[in-house]
Interface confidence: medium
């Protein structure tokens, strides 16, 4: 288990290019938004110290037909080593709570900012 | 400790030309986006310009596009302003700012310099 | 152009609790930053990330964003905290960086 600032991730760390793609492909959905995000679909929220890539992949799996977010499914896939099932890492929902996708991937964004701005990444 | 030092206000005629800059120090400079930001007297904060830390980006605020430019020497850690048509109602203290990541859409500034007063005045 | 609103002014009591309010269309969507100036100064960044706080800046200052406000709240405050705090985002449908007009805050 590699741990990252307490942003845990299995297997091998990304790359920082790869990572700025990620946070990039997060800024672009999250500031163009002209409708709410996935027709306001609720994903399981998830404790982004404790948990990893592959919690964010696990939790955003749940959503289907929703192209705004496929590429961040697919990057998110890209930087976890093995196949996620949806309900696979349940013990890190954060108290059963669900939020949009919207804000689910704001936090993401911001939390993987942090870890940016701590050094973790560069 | 990080340390900006703006430079080169005073006072011009309008339709005269300035050139503002600020030394940096205690970062990689090169690693950061950096900004302008000024604040006419008794007025709010109003953002003029920003740049790239590659400086292949810039920004600029609708009222001084055309007639400011922004660039940045990364080998002496120094940011510019190049003003020209220079109007009444550009006078105001010009901040300095650093940004706190490299992606646009996520950037706060962490650290202000002094200012330097540019009054526009016949 | 996107546009932020600040109420001008806000006034209260030492050791009671302030809260400054950023109001801009869906900005739970954006990214919110605080800066506080004092007169005389350059601004200080306080919040930034919606709710994060610098080193060196106070526990009392915390931030929220959500829906189409964001908060600054500034508990248990001081006279040393009056001063003018201004909201900031970036718009990306302008590449612009947008500040709010700013709030004075009064320490009765």
């Known amino acids: 288990l590699t741990c990252l600032g307490g942003f845990a991730s299995p297997g091998p760390v990304p790359p920082s290019t790869a990572l700025r793609e990620l946070i990039e492909e997060l800024v672009n959905i999250t500031q163009n938004q002209k409708a709410p995000l996935c027709n306001g679909s609720m994903v399981w929220s998830i404790n982004l110290t404790a948990g990893g890539f592959c919690v964010a992949l696990d939790s955003l799996t749940n959503v289907s037909g929703c192209s705004a977010i496929e590429k961040t499914q697919r990057m998110l896939s890209g930087f976890c080593p093995h196949k996620v099932s949806a309900g696979q890492f349940s013990s890190l929902h954060v108290r059963d709570t669900k939020i949009e996708v919207a804000q689910f991937v704001k936090d993401l964004l911001l939390h993987l900012k942090k870890l940016f701005r701590e050094g973790q990444f560069n | 400790e990080v340390q900006l030092l703006e430079s080169g206000g005073g006072l011009v005629q309008p339709g005269g030309s300035l050139r503002l800059s600020c030394a940096a120090s205690?970062?990689?400079?090169?690693?950061?986006?950096m900004s302008w930001v000024r604040q006419a007297p008794g007025k709010g904060l109003e953002w003029v310009s920003a740049i790239s830390g590659s400086g292949g980006s810039t920004y600029y605020a609708d009222s001084v596009k055309g007639r400011f430019t922004i660039s940045r020497d990364n080998s002496k850690n120094t940011l510019y302003l190049q003003m020209n048509s220079l109007r009444a109602e550009d006078t105001a203290v010009y901040y300095c700012?650093?940004?706190?990541?490299?992606?646009?859409?996520?950037?706060?500034?962490?650290?202000w310099g002094q200012g330097t007063l540019v009054t526009v005045s016949s | 152009s996107y546009v932020l609103t600040q109420p001008p002014s806000v006034s209260v009591a030492p050791g009671q609790t302030a809260r400054i309010t950023c109001g801009g269309n869906?900005?739970?969507?954006?990214?919110v930053h605080w800066y506080q100036q004092k007169p005389g100064q350059a601004p200080v960044l306080v919040v930034y990330d919606d709710s994060d706080r610098p080193s060196g800046i106070p526990e009392r200052f915390s931030g929220s964003n959500s829906g189409n406000t964001a908060t600054l709240t500034i508990s248990r405050v001081e006279a040393g905290d009056e001063a003018d705090y201004y909201c900031q985002v970036w718009d990306s449908s302008s590449d612009h960086v947008v500040f709010g007009g700013g709030t004075k805050l009064t320490v009765l």
């Open positions: 869906n900005i739970g969507n954006k990214i």
């Open positions: 700012a650093k940004a706190d990541f490299w992606s646009g859409t996520l950037w706060g500034f962490d650290y």
């Open positions: 205690g970062f990689t400079f090169s690693s950061y986006a």
